[in-house]
Interface confidence: medium
């Protein structure tokens, strides 16, 4: 039993880091493997993560961590019984993938403006709370070509767009994701999408 692709890990910079790797053949990750992780700090304890299968030879482990700070560094040991298969280290602050925003809502009752709001996935005491920017994806269910991205570079988790920038009388979906420039993070996963029917009064055309 050997590691084919070594573990790569990302942190949500709050309480969970996720590590994924591939073995050289089909593996029952939860029964055959254990990922031990330990904060490099005096008196810190080693913790054990029981991996789950992620495809035939793939494994994924969700490491529970206390509040993360930028200096934190973890050692990782992947064991198959008494056999050490791989060892490495992981600095959560250097591999951040933010949590996905939640509660995406489309408010259609503000004259001819669409107001999209969502929730910041972090509590106010988390460093990322004030450092997230967002991308909002809106697309038409009827027309695959009608696909647009709005970059929200201010901190407020909301976006206003004129309803008239979208076609009237058809259904649209929206989703949102986040990233933080300060830690050069990857993008979060997309939030669950929300659907609405876009309708607005066409301006009266004069001839």
């Amino acid at each position: 039993m050997k590691v084919l692709q070594e573990p790569t890990c990302v942190s949500d910079y709050m309480s969970i880091s996720t590590c994924e790797w591939k073995m050289n053949g089909p593996t029952n990750c939860s029964t055959e493997l254990r990922l031990l992780y330990q904060l490099v700090f005096l008196l810190s304890e080693a913790h054990t993560c029981i991996p789950e299968n992620n495809g035939g030879a793939g494994c994924v482990c969700h490491l529970l961590m206390d509040d993360v700070v930028s200096a934190d560094n973890y050692t990782l040991d992947l064991w198959a019984g008494q056999q050490l298969l791989w060892k490495g280290s992981f600095k959560p602050s250097e591999h951040v993938k933010p949590r996905a925003p939640g509660n995406l809502t489309v408010h259609t009752n503000v004259s001819d403006t669409l107001l999209l709001t969502w929730s910041n996935p972090y509590p106010p005491d988390n460093y990322l709370y004030n450092h997230l920017t967002y991308a909002v994806n809106i697309w038409s269910e009827n027309d695959p070509a009608d696909f647009r991205i709005y970059n929200v570079t201010y901190l407020e988790p909301s976006l206003r767009i004129a309803a008239s920038t979208l076609k009237s009388g058809i259904s649209y979906r929206a989703r949102v994701r986040a990233w933080a420039q300060c830690y050069n993070t990857t993008w979060s996963e997309w939030s669950p999408s929300t659907k609405w029917h876009n309708s607005y009064r066409e301006p009266f055309e004069q001839h």
Epitope: L4, E6, L85
Partner: antibody
Framework: EVQLVESGGGLVQPGRSLRLSCAAS????????MHWVRQAPGKGLEWVSG????????GYADSVKGRFTISRDNAKNSLYLQMNSLRAEDTAFYYC???????????????WGQGTTVTVSS | DIQMTQSPSSLSASVGDRVTITCRAS??????LGWYQQKPGKDPKRLIF???NLHGGVPSRFSGGVSGTEFTLTISSLQPEDFATYYC?????????FGGGTKVEIK
């Protein structure tokens, strides 16, 4: 019994290239990481490079980074060290060594070859 | 990169003496350290792996110890065949690094 036999050493001029080979037997070659270690005349041991079992994870000493390339051919039970832009300070006895683990550097080396001499001189 | 500082660089001792060699790592390496013995004109042989574990076939007079970033190799009763040069090796992370070596000579 682990057997590692190095070859390819010799006298070469500065700036030229040389390729070392290591033929392995007596163990399942693709179960283990492998290393190259060198020893200059009258000096101590210096780790040069290492490669994991399937050749995707590589490591190099700063002194050879960008000049040397480690590789392996598991079908041929062989380890290689391509040495380019050789310098006088690369003159040394080069050992091929077997690791105890499969992925780069678990427990250090537990088997060594007899070595091959590389002399870089004009 | 992790530096390994080995001391002493040489020592003279008699058969039956207790000998201790020390290696200090420039940063934490857990127990990722091995000890090797090399005789003139020969390839190195592993004595200890993972700081304290005796390699198969190595006499029990050899032992390894660790305290923080300081590692020791102890020969409890020096034998004639033990006169050689000893090296530590950190295998915690690339690039791997050896200590400078300790030459154990006959007094």
């Amino acid at each position: 019994e682990v057997q590692l036999v190095e070859s390819g050493g010799g006298l070469v001029q500065p700036g030229r290239s040389l390729r070392l080979s290591c033929a392995a037997s007596g163990f399942t070659f693709d179960d283990y990481a492998m290393h190259w270690v060198r020893q200059a005349p009258g000096k101590g041991l210096e780790w040069v490079s290492g490669v994991n079992w399937n050749g995707v994870s590589l490591g190099y000493a700063d002194s050879v980074k960008g000049r040397f390339t480690i590789s392996r051919d598991n079908a041929k039970n062989s380890l290689y060290l391509q040495m380019n832009s050789l310098r006088a300070e690369d003159t040394a006895f080069y050992y091929c060594a077997k690791d105890s683990g499969s992925y780069h550097y678990y427990y250090g080396m537990d088997g060594w070859g007899q070595g091959t001499t590389v002399t870089v001189s004009s | 990169d992790i530096q390994m500082t080995q001391s002493p660089s040489s020592l003279s001792a008699s058969v039956g003496d207790r000998v201790t060699i020390t290696c200090r790592a420039s940063q934490g390496i857990r127990n990722d350290l091995g000890w090797y013995q090399q005789k003139p004109g020969k390839d190195p042989k592993r004595l200890i792996f993972a700081a304290t574990n005796l390699h198969g076939g190595v006499p029990s007079r050899f032992s390894g110890g660790v305290s923080g970033t300081e590692f020791t190799l102890t020969i409890s009763s020096l034998q004639p065949e033990d006169f050689a040069t000893y090296y530590c090796l950190q295998h915690n992370s690339y690039p791997l690094t050896f200590g400078g070596g300790t030459k154990v000579e006959i007094k």
